[in-house]
């Protein structure tokens, strides 16, 4: 039987307001509203918490019966829909210990795990997976790309007691591995030997000057010489113009700076590699994955452009159950959501075309009127006569 620690689908109207607590840490936090957005697969089932004010921090959280994930799998899952074509804003959740004062939750409140998508400018379109390990927030060393379209997407983090993890988007694995390999939780296993240093006589030069090579005697010629073809102008007056000097030209015999030829260095030892030793600071930790206490799920975000909808939150110890829950929620409504969006886009395109047509028609009418105003008064004649007289209808 799977343990379901937290589940929230917002299916009871305003009931969510009694379960979710707004932080009072700042007076100007943005407001969440319950909405299924401008398009959806199912208007009721797709209702979730939507950010509603631009350029705001948001801080909202819900508590649950505290639990520890020691010795068991932890699965965190939720859906995010950036229907506003997000430019910069978070779509991630934080899992806190139950010691969190929910009314004072803010960006620096200590959390256990942070997980989910984050978009900001062209440089950031990533899924954060951050663990608080011994009081420090440790970021994943891999770059996991998040979805940046306007549709609802399902994000899943799985942390297992064998210190492995998996990240899924839309129920498909996008990353997996070992916690020790993909985060800097522990000091490196090996370090450079602090007592070792490059020997004084270590020669890293692959090539050296050939000691037997010498500069040819006729090498040193000046770079510039007086132009031998130049002649003193006939009207040159030495008293007035000073002593005449022929113009200087590039010396065709100039060879530049002489450099001895290069030969292989017989003493070359290669690049010195600093020897490594076992790091005395390193010791494995089989319980990196484990937390004593989870008790609060929080949305602690900044959004430049609001409109993101969060829904279908689930915290459980059962991977199969989470996958099934994802398929029964996001999986069921995703196609209809896309259909509704496509239909809206099509209607918008049609409206735009109609508006363009109307505008063109108005412009033609205006041009016609202008032309009539500017042309000389026409005598009342039949069309045939008018044409013969050279009048042309617009």
């Amino acid at each position: 039987e799977p343990a379901v620690y937290f589940k929230e689908q917002f299916l009871d109207g305003d009931g969510w307001t009694s379960r979710w607590i707004e932080s009072k840490h700042k007076s100007d936090f943005g407001k969440f509203v319950l909405s299924s957005g401008k398009f959806y697969g199912d208007e009721e089932k797709d209702k979730g918490l939507q950010t509603s004010q631009d350029a705001r921090f948001y801080a909202l959280s819900a508590s649950f019966e505290p639990f520890s994930n020691k010795g068991q799998t932890l699965v965190v899952q939720f859906t995010v829909k950036h229907e506003q074509n997000i430019d910069c804003g978070g779509g991630y959740v934080k899992l806190f210990p139950n010691s969190l004062d929910q009314t004072d939750m803010h960006g620096d409140s200590e959390y256990n795990i942070m997980f989910g998508p984050d978009i900001c400018g062209p440089g950031t379109k990533k899924v954060h997976v951050i663990f608080n390990y011994k009081g420090k927030n440790v970021l994943i060393n891999k770059d996991i790309r998040c979805k940046d379209d306007e549709f609802t997407h399902l994000y899943t983090l799985i942390v297992r007691p064998d210190n492995t993890y998996e990240v899924k988007i839309d129920n498909s694995q996008v990353e997996s591995g070992s916690l020790e390999d993909d985060w800097d939780f522990l000091p490196p296993k090996k370090i450079k030997d602090p007592d070792a240093s490059k020997p004084e006589d270590w020669d890293e030069r692959a090539k050296i000057d050939d000691p037997t090579d010498s500069k040819p005697e006729d090498w040193d010629k000046p770079e510039h010489i007086p132009d031998p073809d130049a002649k003193k102008p006939e009207d040159w007056d030495e008293e007035m113009d000073g002593e005449w000097e022929p113009p200087v030209i590039q010396n065709p015999e100039y060879k530049g700076e002489w450099k001895p030829r290069q030969i292989d260095n017989p003493d070359y030892k290669g690049t010195w590699i600093h020897p490594e030793i076992d790091n005395p600071e390193y010791s494995p930790d089989p319980s990196i994955y484990a937390y004593d206490n989870f008790g609060v799920l929080g949305l602690d975000l900044w959004q430049v452009k609001s409109g993101t909808i969060f829904d279908n939150f689930l915290i459980t110890n059962d991977e199969a159950y989470a996958e099934e829950f994802g398929n029964e929620t996001w999986g069921v409504t995703k196609a209809a959501e896309k259909q509704m969006k496509d239909k809206q886009d099509e209607e918008q395109r049609t409206r735009r075309m109609m508006r363009t047509k109307m505008r063109m028609r108005r412009m033609r009418r205006t041009r016609r009127k202008m032309r009539r105003k500017m042309s000389p008064a026409r005598p009342r004649t039949s069309c045939r006569e008018a044409c013969l007289q050279g009048w042309t209808e617009a």
Epitope: C88, G90, G107, G121, G123, K136, W302
Partner: antibody, heavy 127, light 107 residues
Framework: EVQLVQSGAEVKKPGSSVKVSCKAS????????ISWVRQAPGQGLEWMGG????????NYAQKFQGRVTITADESTSTAYMELSSLRSEDTAVYYC????????????????????WGQGTTVTVSS | SYELTQPPSVSVAPGKTARITCGGN??????VHWYQQKPGQAPVLVIY???KRPSGIPERFSGSNSGNTATLTISGTQAMDEADYYC?????????FGGGTKLTVLG
């Protein structure tokens, strides 16, 4: 990679204000956070505040709160730092520095350090 | 407010290992960055996130951070490494720098 070019040296009277500019090129301005750091003669580095242009909001060190204003103009990829009520202790080299923006939270860029610095602007406050 | 403490100066013989410390209350829970500054020049980031090297920074620069001390280690120190070094962290919603350490390469 982004490059930062700062405005020229300034000599100011006590009580007046100074506005130093920092123009970014060679990168997307909205992908960075800009910090302002000053260094008095023979002293260490001191953070004054920073701005994330895409946010539009600035964050200030408590010491300078109310006296410093940091702004950014995305259209010209330029950040500005204005310090008012100048006193002789404000004589320093003022640097702008950028951090890559790796997330939407205020603190994200501080995880990555300030990887590009302007050449510095000397501000002398003297009567 | 959060404070970072560095020794004012450290000396090292060429080719030997230099260690510069940065002390702060539970600094091991923070992300620490290190900057090198040579006279008349702007600072240069040499280590970020405790131990990561930006591209272009030689391998001899490394960093560690745990407990109440972060350390910048320069192995096989060269004359060109002579400079001021500053540690930096994010504490209490503000950026904090250490007071700086002057590294002298002897000889």
């Amino acid at each position: 990679e982004v490059q930062l070019v700062q405005s020229g040296a300034e000599v100011k009277k006590p009580g007046s204000s100074v506005k130093v500019s920092c123009k970014a090129s060679g990168g997307t301005f909205s992908s960075y956070a800009i910090s302002w750091v000053r260094q008095a003669p023979g002293q260490g580095l001191e953070w004054m505040g920073g701005i994330i242009p895409i946010f539009g909001t600035a964050n200030y060190a408590q010491k300078f709160q109310g006296r410093v204003t940091i702004t950014a103009d995305e259209s010209t990829s330029t950040a500005y730092m204005e310090l008012s009520s100048l006193r002789s202790e404000d004589t320093a080299v003022y640097y702008c520095a950028s951090s890559p923006l790796r997330g939407s939270g205020w603190y994200w860029h501080y995880y990555y350090g300030m990887d590009v610095w302007g050449q510095g602007t000397t501000v002398t406050v003297s009567s | 407010s959060y404070e970072l403490t560095q020794p004012p100066s450290v000396s090292v013989a060429p080719g030997k290992t230099a260690r510069i410390t940065c002390g702060g209350n539970k600094i091991g829970t923070k992300s620490v960055h290190w900057y090198q500054q040579k006279p008349g020049q702007a600072p240069v980031l040499v280590i970020y996130q405790d131990s990561k090297r930006p591209s272009g920074i030689p391998e001899r620069f490394s960093g560690s951070n745990s407990g109440n001390t972060a350390t910048l280690t320069i192995s096989g120190t060269q004359a060109m490494d002579e400079a001021d070094y500053y540690c930096q962290a994010w504490g209490s919603s503000t950026v904090v720098f250490g007071g700086g350490t002057k590294l002298t390469v002897l000889g």
